[in-house]
Amino acid sequence: ESALITQQDLAPQQRAAPQQKRSSPSEGLCPPGHHISEDGRDCISCKYGQDYSTHWNDLLFCLRCTRCDSGEVELSPCTTTRNTVCQCEEGTFREEDSPEMCRKCRTGCPRGMVKVGDCTPWSDIECVHKESGTKHSGEVPAVEETVTSSPGTPASPCSLSG
């Protein structure tokens, strides 16, 4: 019994060659930016700006690039190895409980409260009670994995063991 495959297990020449249209799968898998052919013999490049794959895979198709919605700005475009990164426009934020839409930030705090945090693309303004300093229940915490991190070409979402 052995651990599941990681990028490091694969031959260096298989790790990525964006300029190549086709390469051979390694242990049945294709590198980020590619998908496997129907006959399993080739790795086919994703189409820049149309589709992508971020991980080693045996997908028959690359994943479709996300299109930013109205009310969003494109922080970085879709490449063959990374999906589009969209961010809410200024004055709006994406709530963790409803990530599919940007919501307007509040313009001010309720009476008796003071603003301690600004509107960001991932959180509403933060209000606390003047006296106690406790947060207003309407406050939305910032998302941990912010949109600025660059994934590179990861092998797997986490280390797996058999």
Epitope: S2, I5, G28, L59, P157, C158, L160, S161
Partner: antibody, heavy 121, light 111 residues
Framework: EVQLVESGGGLVQPGGSLRLSCAAS????????MSWVRQAPGKGLELVAA????????HYPDTVKGRFTISRDNAKNSLYLQMNSLRAEDTAVYYC??????????????WGQGTLVTVSS | DIVLTQSPDSLAVSLGERATINCRAS??????????MHWYQQKPGQPPKLLIY???NLESGVPDRFSGSGSRTDFTLTISSLQAEDVAVYYC?????????FGGGTKVEIK
């Protein structure tokens, strides 16, 4: 069209053994991860074993580790599950599946019709 | 292990109405802009069938009345206009972490 056909299920006593087979067609079998998923009567789904395209990488959950063995014969387009030391809680329909890989074994793209294994005295 | 909790356990929806199924993970299943959550449909006496992969990607051949959304720990499968053939049990499944785990299922019936 992808077809996965399981066989080998049946009634077995606790402590007994059984070998399940899965015949695959309509896909380049030697290119893909394969797996066995089971479903106890009226219950949910559980991954039992997974194997990569050349058989070099294998995974079992703790519930079956040391008792079940997954293997494949790419020349015969066949997947196997050897089940030893069977227990009443292993009673389930066992499905042969084609497991898509995306960064790690990820989702179950194709399923066979399943074969019923009953462990009872 | 990541535990997936589906809600409700069952729901009855009128034909043509919207059905919404939720799946909550015990920890985030997001990384590198991907949500490692997938959805299946299982009709009585049949094996499960893949509907949605990576939270929102519709599997080839699946009607577009099915859609998936969500991120991190909270995910939703929506059937925009329920049809008679959609009566089934629906399961979520995560592949962020070993072992791969499934939710307990949500039974969808016609009201």
């Amino acid at each position: 069209e992808v077809q996965l056909v399981e066989s080998g299920g049946g009634l077995v006593q606790p402590g007994g053994s059984l070998r399940l087979s899965c015949a695959a067609s309509g896909l380049p079998f030697n290119s893909y991860y394969m797996s066995w998923v089971r479903q106890a009567p009226g219950k949910g789904l559980e991954l039992v074993a997974a194997i990569n395209s050349n058989g070099g990488r294998i995974h079992y959950p703790d519930t079956v580790k040391g008792r079940f063995t997954i293997s494949r014969d790419n020349a015969k387009n066949s997947l196997y599950l050897q089940m030893n030391s069977l227990r009443a809680e292993d009673t389930a329909v066992y499905y042969c599946t084609r497991l898509t890989y995306y960064g790690n074994p990820a989702w179950f793209a194709y399923w066979g019709q399943g074969t019923l294994v009953t462990v009872s005295s | 292990d990541i535990v997936l909790t589906q809600s409700p356990d069952s729901l009855a929806v009128s034909l043509g109405e919207r059905a919404t199924i939720n799946c909550r993970a015990s920890e985030s299943v997001d990384i590198y802009g991907n949500s490692f959550m997938h959805w299946y449909q299982q009709k009585p006496g049949q094996p499960p069938k893949l509907l949605i992969y990576l939270s929102s990607n519709l599997e080839s051949g699946v009607p577009d009345r099915f859609s998936g959304s969500g991120s991190r720990t909270d995910f939703t499968l929506t059937i925009s206009s329920l049809q008679a053939e959609d009566v089934a049990v629906y399961y979520c499944q995560q592949s962020y972490e070993d072992p791969l785990t499934f939710g307990g299922g949500t039974k969808v019936e016609i009201k």
